[in-house]
């Protein structure tokens, strides 16, 4: 970077090299060039020569003043115009940064995704700081009083094998950067209460021709948790409002849920589950699309497990008696 150049003098920033965004700052340049009484001192920001607010302080030093500096990062360097030198002479350079002190981390959440082998802790970091901000996650056993600390730039995955101090812990997060430090409230957790079941996935849908046509949604999870509560939400793709159905589920077999839907309408379905009575839910599953038939034929929509939900294409094949389409929309 700019800080690695050989200097013939000195460049410095007041109040500091890293400062609060929106501050007025002064950049000083002091030349120490052999056989040169600088006629002029020039400042450059990101390679562009600065024109305004440059004040000469004395024979060797000049000041560049910025009002309300808002750039997160800038490379500054300064040069001297020496008599009898055709080109400007480089004095020195410095990278400067502006940003904000961290907000108090809040909404600290720790969950164990089933089969992951990790406790994942996340938090709301607050407003963007623009500068390097580190987070220390403190995990303290309420049984042994032993405390462990984990340094990270965002969230943290802590191996459940390293949580040897029993089941109950206090978790809190400290945020720190060059402009300040803040600490979250403490979160009390019990490892058995924060497990989120293995993801529930909708595999297919079919509409059965009957007096009143009926749509069956097939869905499943690999969870070994016995008592699981789930929600399935659905709506016509043209609607804003979701309908929600609740289920107490036993995943020893594939779930089948029945819906009576309007004909010839494209619907979207999503499912999520939690261990019954616990705090945390899975995130909603990927959207699963199914269009109900106009009238008679049986329609099946399949989620191909190897496909990720991405495209906007409909794959359709017509065979005797029913229409099959995948879940990827139009």
């Amino acid at each position: 970077g700019i800080t690695n150049i050989n200097c013939s003098g000195h460049i410095w920033v007041e109040p500091a090299t890293i400062f609060k965004m929106g501050m007025n700052i002064s950049i000083y340049c002091q030349a120490a060039i052999k056989n040169c009484q600088p006629r002029k001192l020039h400042f450059y920001k990101n390679g562009i020569k600065e024109r305004f607010q440059i004040t000469r302080i004395n024979k060797t030093t000049a000041r560049l003043w910025y009002k309300n500096f808002l750039e997160p990062h800038a490379s500054m360097y300064c040069t001297a115009e020496c008599p009898k030198h055709f080109q400007e002479t480089l004095i020195c350079g410095k990278d400067i940064s502006s940003g904000y002190p961290p907000d108090i981390p809040d909404e600290v959440t720790c969950v164990i995704y089933e089969y992951s082998g990790n406790m994942t802790c996340t938090w709301n970091a607050g407003k963007l700081t623009y500068i390097d901000t580190k987070y220390v996650v403190h995990v303290k056993s309420l049984e042994t009083e032993e405390e462990q600390q984990y340094l990270t730039s965002s969230y943290i995955n802590i191996s459940t094998d390293s949580l040897q101090g029993g089941k109950k812990y206090l978790v809190w997060v400290q945020a720190a950067n060059a402009l300040g430090m803040e600490e979250s409230k403490q979160l009390q957790i019990h490892l058995d209460d924060i497990v989120i079941p293995s993801a529930a996935v909708i595999s297919r849908a079919e509409t059965i021709n009957a007096t009143v046509p009926k749509t069956i949604i097939y869905w499943d999870s690999q969870t070994t948790i016995e008592k699981v509560s789930c929600e399935m939400r659905y709506k016509a793709t043209t609607n804003q409002t979701w309908n929600v159905k609740e289920f107490d589920t036993n995943f020893t077999y594939v779930q089948q849920s029945e819906f009576y839907l309007e004909p010839n309408i494209k619907y979207v379905f999503q499912v999520r589950c939690q261990e019954t009575g616990k705090r945390y839910w899975q995130p909603w599953s990927s959207p699963f699309f199914h269009k109900t038939p106009e009238t008679v034929p049986q329609v099946t929509s399949k989620a191909f497990q190897h496909d990720t939900w991405n495209s906007g294409l409909t794959v359709a094949s017509i065979s005797t008696g029913h229409l099959t389409s995948d879940n990827r929309g139009d």
Partner: antibody, heavy 119, light 107 residues
């Protein structure tokens, strides 16, 4: 050799607009700052507006007396400098010179164009 | 902005005279000073830059000196074509500023 030719001056009523041009040749236009310096009848020289070279990212400067009324611009493809003068006042009456600066002193000057603001 | 004060505002001299015009800056301008000559109805012409460097094509009877805040333009032997108005310009700090001018007239 360096040549600067101003045009666009004339008699104009107060409140009206005028656009001056300065056609430049004989030097690398991009690498030089360009200025408008005016001289009221019988008075001294005053920097009115300045548009800097590429190395300064073409930063512009205006004297307080013309801020928000005058606009300096340059067309590097045509080697031409402009001064758009709006809301003209009697005190804007002057000879307007186009000048070139590589350092910050004015090395070359045009012959000037007279602007008379009168009702 | 830096203020430039020129003196005298006018002077009368004869051909062959040694003429000195001074320019004082409101702060140290570190030899960033230029001198211009302007004849009636003509554009200014650069004579001297960096306080003492003679612009190409300018007769050697013109010279400049000075440092800090005080600067001098000297015409060693005044010629008929030198009767004109002379201006100093500081370009140490932006924006550059002119002195108010010194008119050199025939005595």
């Amino acid at each position: 050799q360096v040549q600067l030719v101003e045009s666009g001056g004339g008699v104009v009523q107060p409140g009206r607009s005028l656009r001056l041009s300065c056609a430049a040749s004989g030097f690398d236009f991009n690498s030089y700052g360009m200025s408008w310096v005016r001289q009221a009848p019988g008075k001294g020289l005053d920097l009115v507006a300045d548009i800097n070279s590429k190395s300064y990212n073409y930063a512009t400067y205006y004297a307080d007396s013309v801020k928000d009324r005058f606009t300096i611009s340059r067309d590097n493809s045509k080697n031409t400098l402009y001064l758009q003068m709006n809301s003209l006042r009697a005190e804007d009456t002057a000879v307007y010179y186009c000048a070139v600066h590589h350092s910050d002193y004015f090395e070359y000057w045009g012959q000037g164009t007279l602007v008379t603001v009168s009702s | 902005d830096i203020q430039m004060t020129q003196s005298p505002s006018s002077l009368s001299a004869s051909v062959g005279d040694r003429v000195t015009i001074t320019c004082r800056a409101s702060q140290d301008i570190y030899t960033n000073l230029a001198w211009y000559q302007q004849k009636p109805g003509k554009a200014p012409k650069l004579l001297i830059y960096h306080a003492s460097s003679l612009q190409e094509g300018v007769p050697s009877r013109f010279s400049g000196s000075g440092s800090g805040t005080d600067y001098t333009l000297t015409i060693s032997s005044l010629q008929p074509e030198d009767f004109a108005t002379y201006y100093c310009l500081q370009d140490s700090e932006y924006p550059p500023t002119f002195g108010q001018g010194t008119k050199v007239e025939i005595k």
